[in-house]
């Protein structure tokens, strides 16, 4: 048993049919010694008396808020949550496996630049009685500070007969050095509590591996005289690290016809302009990627040819 926060405790339960459970001793936080009784949740049934209460925790029915009283007065509370392990595997019931980039991906994180700021998000089908707490650090043995905000509900969508909820959190490395080579990964830890169930989820990554630039901005077309060609120009996104001479991007320019089946013409360039042939009803799209490290491409920025 360990303390999650004040008066909230997590019992780690290795569960299997007929498992003996975990013996837990609760102590009433009071100088009183006599006349103390214990109850669970809203029940008035007295579970025991004395300054300590020993219980055998076998299932969720044994979890909840234990209260010690004396003469009708509440002395203290202890909320017991369960963290369940089955066949040697901790439960992962609260969050949905996003399966990207691989199975058992519950947390996904992205950074728009090398400033040490990043966003993580996760999915659940649970709509009520749900709380999240997020902690992060650089490295784990001698951790360096990363400050995370509160997790917030960022999107809701319907998937079949299910509603899916997306939560996200923003974190910032306290002493980020954008130009430095990373040697220790960022660790992100999410505590999830649903009703009386506790679960924890972790992700470990280097900022360089989760970089996804914003799309190029100010995408413009300039027709070239007496030609079907156009000059496409764009700028680095505002959110990208500076100076651009050091934090350089490479770009992919694509000409796409109205039909998805039409052949796409693609040009790769390190410049912020390119010359392409603009077909009728086609559109021109540009996306960006770190020039020196193959992390994710940005989303496309697009303009119609006409």
């Amino acid at each position: 048993i360990w303390e999650l926060k004040k008066d909230v405790y997590v019992v780690e339960l290795d569960w299997y049919p007929d498992a003996p459970g975990e013996m837990v001793v609760l102590t009433c936080d009071t100088p009183e010694e006599d006349g103390i009784t214990w109850t669970l949740d809203q029940s008035s049934e007295v579970l025991g008396s004395g300054k300590t209460l020993t219980i055998q925790v076998k299932e969720f029915g044994d979890a909840g808020q234990y209260t010690c009283h004396k003469g009708g007065e509440v002395l203290s509370h202890s909320l017991l949550l369960l963290h369940k392990k089955e066949d040697g595997i901790w439960s992962t019931d609260i969050l949905k496996d996003q399966k990207e980039p691989k199975n058992k991906t519950f947390l996904r994180c992205e950074a728009k630049n090398y400033s040490g700021r990043f966003t993580c998000w996760w999915l659940t089908t649970i709509s009520t009685d749900l709380t999240f707490s997020v902690k992060s650090s650089r490295g784990s043995s001698d951790p360096q500070g990363v400050t995370c905000g509160a997790a917030t509900l960022s999107a809701e969508r319907v998937r079949g007969d299910n509603k899916e909820y997306e939560y996200s959190v923003e974190c910032q490395e306290d002493s980020a050095c954008p130009a430095a080579e990373e040697s220790l990964p960022i660790e992100v830890m999410v505590d999830a509590v649903h009703k009386l169930k506790y679960e924890n989820y972790t992700s470990s990554f280097f900022i360089r591996d989760i970089i996804k630039p914003d799309p190029p901005k100010n995408l413009q077309l300039k027709p070239l005289k007496n030609s079907r060609q156009v000059e496409v120009s764009w700028e680095y996104p505002d959110t990208w690290s500076t100076p651009h001479s050091y934090f350089s991007l490479t770009f992919c320019v694509q000409v796409q016809g109205k039909s998805k089946r039409e052949k796409k013409d693609r040009v790769f360039t390190d410049k912020t302009s390119a010359t392409v042939i603009c077909r009728k009803n086609a559109s021109i799209s540009v996306r960006a990627q770190d020039r020196y490290y193959s992390s994710s491409w940005s989303e496309w920025a697009s303009v119609p040819c006409s």
Epitope: K58, E59, F60, E86, D87, D161, N162
Partner: nanobody
Framework: EVQLVESGGGVVQAGESLRLSCAAS????????MGWFRQAPGTEREFVAA????????YYADSVKGRFTISRDNAKNTVYLQMSSLKPEDTAVYYC????????????????WGQGTQVTVSS
């Protein structure tokens, strides 16, 4: 919301078998831990069995262990309770329940309930 409808109850002789079904509709059945409870006249609702959503792990009350088997078919959105070697003390209204916590024998850990099906075991 999940709607639960039990069926399969009836009158049997002691020692005989019966299979109860609980059909779920509404939100995704596979997101829920499922349980069976029973209530005899003048008594509190009593836990019978539960089955987990992921691994179909099972959990039984001592009084039915070895005699009753709970199972689920996520494709059919149905949970079953196979009852054998029935005794007169198994007579009760049997309720199907859906919740978020497995294992739990506590009725208030279940969020959705069916209307119940009567099982009567005569000696």
């Amino acid at each position: 919301e999940v709607q639960l409808v039990e069926s399969g109850g009836g009158v049997v002789q002691a020692g005989e078998s019966l299979r109860l079904s609980c059909a779920a509709s509404g939100r995704s059945f596979s997101n829920y831990e499922m349980g069976w409870f029973r209530q005899a006249p003048g008594t509190e609702r009593e836990f019978v069995a539960a089955i987990s959503r992921r691994r179909s792990s099972t959990y039984y009350a001592d009084s039915v262990k070895g005699r009753f088997t709970i199972s689920r078919d996520n494709a059919k959105n149905t949970v079953y309770l196979q009852m054998s070697s029935l005794k007169p003390e198994d007579t009760a209204v049997y309720y199907c329940a859906a919740g978020a916590l497995f294992p739990s024998s506590r009725s208030r850990d279940y969020d959705y309930w069916g209307q119940g099906t009567q099982v009567t075991v005569s000696s």
